[in-house]
Interface confidence: low
């Protein structure tokens, strides 16, 4: 499923990550722009074997199990294929876990270098929510 | 609107093997999970897995691996449950749903009876 | 796996009567719990989504409560139509599990 804007921030905000460990939701929107332009079936190959899965590509090296990643550790104890629903929940919960993992946000590459410090506001402003 | 039409009721002896049918109308067949989940009378409600059709992704609940195997064909917007090796335990209703965390469509399910 | 457990098994109403049927989690589950109503013979059926939320044109009687490991399905003046079976289920994590169920029937 690709989200719409304010489709997906309502989602997130559902499902509770606003401001989840000081977050605001427009983090949350900018980071899945970027990691996955806002597409639950994403799925991108690394150098070192893993893969990036979903809306906010997660990685199989240490969060999924996808079957195929040597050493995975898969500290969201989900198969990566869940990743890839339309439906949210799993990822949230995964990522839940990775902010809460000592670096914050900054487990996400794009966000690092797409939206942190920027007007992150900006991707719910107009959004129902 | 959205809709899972199951295959019919099955009578098949122990042993065989069995292939369930749901087809899928009404929304975009490939970017959602299909769901079965197996009924019998006292026991409740059962999750076998799920398959999503666009990749061919599936996981199973430990508990049917090698009982139930998934597959999609997304040319016609149907998912298929195959269950091998058939007993009396098998004999239930199998629903088809789509899933979205929670199921809010519903196959019409599929009797499967099992007996020699 | 995360076991739902429903109470009561049954439940022996009078129609108008206001009744609130239980979903205990073995673990905390957050907010990932959604509630079906099944009538003898017939598919399930989505009443409640994510603990409270209603779904499309379910009535305004049934309405759902809690957080992490207790849940409560509530229905405020029991109609005819009503009676069956009703199951809570998880989706906090896999495998997908289902309450054993609470059969709701006439008194």
């Known amino acids: 499923k690709v989200f719409g804007r304010c489709e997906l921030a309502a989602a997130m905000k559902r499902h509770g990550l606003d401001n989840y460990r000081g977050y605001s939701l427009g983090n949350w929107v900018c980071a899945a722009k970027f990691e996955s332009n806002f597409n639950t079936q994403a799925t991108n190959r690394n150098t070192d074997g893993s893969t990036d899965y979903g809306i906010l590509q997660i990685n199989s090296r240490w969060w999924c199990n996808d079957g195929r990643t040597p050493g995975s550790r898969n500290l969201c104890n989900i198969p990566c294929s869940a990743l890839l629903s339309s439906d949210i929940t799993a990822s949230v919960n995964c990522a839940k876990k990775i902010v809460s993992d000592g670096n914050g946000m900054n487990a996400w590459v794009a966000w690092r270098n797409r939206c942190k410090g920027t007007d992150v506001q900006a991707w719910i402003r107009g959004c129902r929510l | 609107q959205v809709q899972l039409q199951e295959s019919g009721a099955e009578v098949m002896k122990p042993g065989a093997s069995v292939k369930i049918s749901c087809k899928a109308t009404g929304y975009t067949f490939s970017t959602y999970w299909i769901e079965w989940v197996k009924q019998r009378p006292g026991h409740g409600l059962e999750w076998i897995g799920e398959i999503l059709p666009g990749s061919g992704s599936t996981y199973y609940n430990e508990k049917f691996k090698g009982k139930a195997t998934f597959t999609a064909d997304t040319s016609s917007n149907t998912a298929y449950m195959q269950l091998s090796s058939l007993t009396s335990e098998d004999s239930a209703v199998y629903y088809c749903?789509?899933?979205?965390?929670?199921?809010?469509?519903w196959g019409q399910g599929t009797t499967l009876t099992v007996s020699s | 796996d995360i076991e739902l457990t429903q109470s009561p098994a049954t439940l022996s109403v009078t129609p108008g009567d206001s009744v609130s049927l239980s979903c205990r989690a073995s673990q905390s589950i957050s907010n990932n719990l959604h509630w079906y109503q099944q009538k003898s013979h017939e598919s399930p059926r989505l009443l409640i989504k994510?603990?409270?939320q209603s779904s499309s044109g379910i009535p305004s009687r049934f309405s759902g409560s809690g957080s992490g490991t207790d849940f409560t399905l509530s229905i405020n003046s029991v109609e005819t139509e009503d009676f069956g079976m009703y199951f809570c289920q998880q989706s906090n994590s896999w495998p997908r599990t289902f309450g054993g169920g609470t059969k709701l029937e006439i008194k």
């Open positions: 994510y603990v409270s």
């Open positions: 749903a789509r899933g979205d965390g929670f199921y809010g469509y």
